[in-house]
Each structure stands twice: as C-alpha cells, then as structure tokens.
Interface confidence: low
Amino acid sequence: MEDEKPKVNPKLYMCVCEGLSCGNEDHCEGQQCFSSLSINDGFHVYQKGCFQVYEQGKMTCKTPPSPGQAVECCQGDWCNRNITAQLPTKGKSFPGTQNFHLE
C-alpha cells in the first residue's frame, strides 16, 4: 500500500454544501470549506461549499469583505457548518484578510 494507514487524504475535508451550485447534494469535499454571503438584486444569498483546489480557495478567502460580498473559509471536516458570513457594517474598519478557522 502506497500511503500510510488509515487511507485518508489529509488535504481533503468534508464540507456542508448549501446553495444552487450544490444541486441535490448537501455536502462536498475539498481542500477548504467556505461560507459566503452576497447581495444579488437586493436579496441576501447565502452559500456554503468547498474549494477543491487550494489556490482557488486561497485567492477567494483572502479577499476582504465588501458591502456586497463576504466569504469565510476554514479547514476541517464540516467546519463551515456553524459559520455564517457577515457583511461589514458601514463605517466599521476590518482587517484586510478573513479569519482562517482551524478545527
């Protein structure tokens, strides 16, 4: 056997998946999980899912929240289950990168 047991890929996490991109699935697997909130035509659109390529997630997760979109990322099985992304309050200062949750 090529890899040490148990046969688990340590870079892959199970994530909660919610939103149109999930189809009928309620979970996905990727190298990072995320929870996002965006405003489309005045409606708040919440999504949860996973980035299957680390670089893709790294770019998105380091984007500062804006009045129209916020993304929170984490690494760990189901780590995005209880994360709800929040848009910044007007006038409130915030750091240039999102918190990175490790579970």
């Epitope: 056997m1 090529e2 047991k5 148990p6 046969k7 688990v8 890929n9 870079k11 892959l12 199970m14 979970h27 697997e29 990727g30 190298q31 299957q52 390529v53």
Partner: antibody, heavy 115, light 107 residues
C-alpha cells in the same frame, strides 16, 4: 457533488472478460481513491480494488490474479477488467470514491454470467 | 484480512422502536469504522464515518459508538423510510471489508 457514471457489458459467457468504465464528474480526480465494489444478487458487498490518479493500485487478494484496474486521467475515468469470469462473478458492480468512506457511488451495473 | 462480523443478520421492529446493530472486527481497527444504508434497488449510502460522525443531511436518529473491535449502530426511533440493509465497513488496512449486513424490516 462528485458524480460517477458507469457503463459496460451486462451479459457475459463463462471464461470471457468483464469490462466496466466509470466517469467522474465535478470532482478533483487527484483527491480520491477510485474503487470498484460488487454485490452478488441478494448478498453483501465485496471490495475488489482501488486506484489513484497516479495509477497506483491495490487489489483484493482473493481476486488479484484476475482483476485489473486502470485510470485515464485525461478523461477523468477509471476502468475494471475481470478475466475468466464464471457464474460466481454475477453481481451488481459499483464504482465509488473513497476518502474516509465510500461517499460517492455510481448507479451500479448488473453483470450476468451465463452460458 | 480483517473480518467484520455483524449481528443480527435481520430484525423486525415497530415504528418508533429503538434499533441497535453491532459490528465486531477481528482485530483492532481504531476508529476507522463506517456505517452504510442500502435501500432496495439503490447503491449504498454512507451514513456515519469514523464510528460516530454523522454525514450532514443524515437524520440525527442515526448514531454510532465504539472503538477498537466492538462497534454499534443505533436508530433511536425507527421510521418507515429506514427499511433497508445496513452495513459496517472498516478502512484500517487493506483489503477493505464489510460486515455481512443487517436487514431491518417493520413489524
């Protein structure tokens, strides 16, 4: 979100070679162990073997001499070949993706071996 | 090979009953034990991984416990849609093996 779609011949004669292919959609092909599992009618589940994106394989020792699993990363597909089939190989064959468990499954293909 | 012995092979219970299935490994498999549900005519579905972790979307009436060689799977309140065959499976080493299955019916 990973979806597996499988196909292959459903009716074989004894001594022929079973051949099935499984296509992977919406998934990172390098992130999983790609497996084949079979289930004889009315019976339990038997693991046949696995392959990763690099082509490294592991087989069930009970079938090692007859089974071959291969991968085509350019098409995100993997295949099963089982030689010298007999009636005992009659089963539903599933392709499946394994990480901490077999989370994603193909629809299953009933393969019947009969003369 | 690691043998997985599942019991009972079949059971019948009433809606609302508590149902427990056991699985015994022939050697220590740590926590590398999963449970699947297979409804008639369908592929198996992963319910619980690593002994007790519920896959999201799976109802909380399903649970698992154990470690080492002895494991159990419980449906706290049996529902009509739970009619299925349940399998345990280890992934501590190769070959991966399954228990023989437990068929659950409504009395």
């Amino acid at each position: 979100q990973v979806q597996l779609q499988q196909w292959g011949a459903g009716l074989l004669k004894p001594s022929e070679t079973l051949s099935l292919t499984c296509a992977v959609y919406n998934g990172s092909f390098s992130s999983y162990y790609w497996n084949w599992i079979r289930q004889p009618p009315g019976k339990g589940l038997e693991w046949l073997g696995e392959i990763n994106h690099r082509g490294s394989t592991n087989y069930n020792p009970s079938l090692t001499s007859r089974v071959t699993i291969s991968v085509d990363t350019s098409k995100n597909q993997f295949s099963l070949k089982l030689t010298s089939v007999t009636a005992a190989d009659t089963a539903i064959y599933y392709c499946t993706a394994h990480t901490r468990g077999f989370l994603y499954w193909g629809q299953g293909t009933l393969v019947t071996v009969s003369s | 090979d690691i043998q997985m012995t599942q019991s009972p092979s079949s059971l019948s219970a009433s809606v609302g009953d508590r149902v427990t299935i056991t699985c015994q490994a022939s050697q220590d498999i740590n926590i590398y034990l999963n449970w699947y549900q297979q409804q008639p005519g369908k592929a198996p579905k992963l319910l619980i991984y690593d002994v007790s972790n519920l896959v999201p979307g799976v109802p909380s009436r399903f649970s698992g416990t154990g470690s080492g060689t002895h494991f159990s799977f419980t449906i706290s309140s049996l529902q009509p849609e739970d009619i299925a065959t349940y399998y345990c499976q280890h992934y501590d080493d190769l070959p991966l093996t399954f228990g023989g299955g437990t068929t659950v019916a409504i009395r």
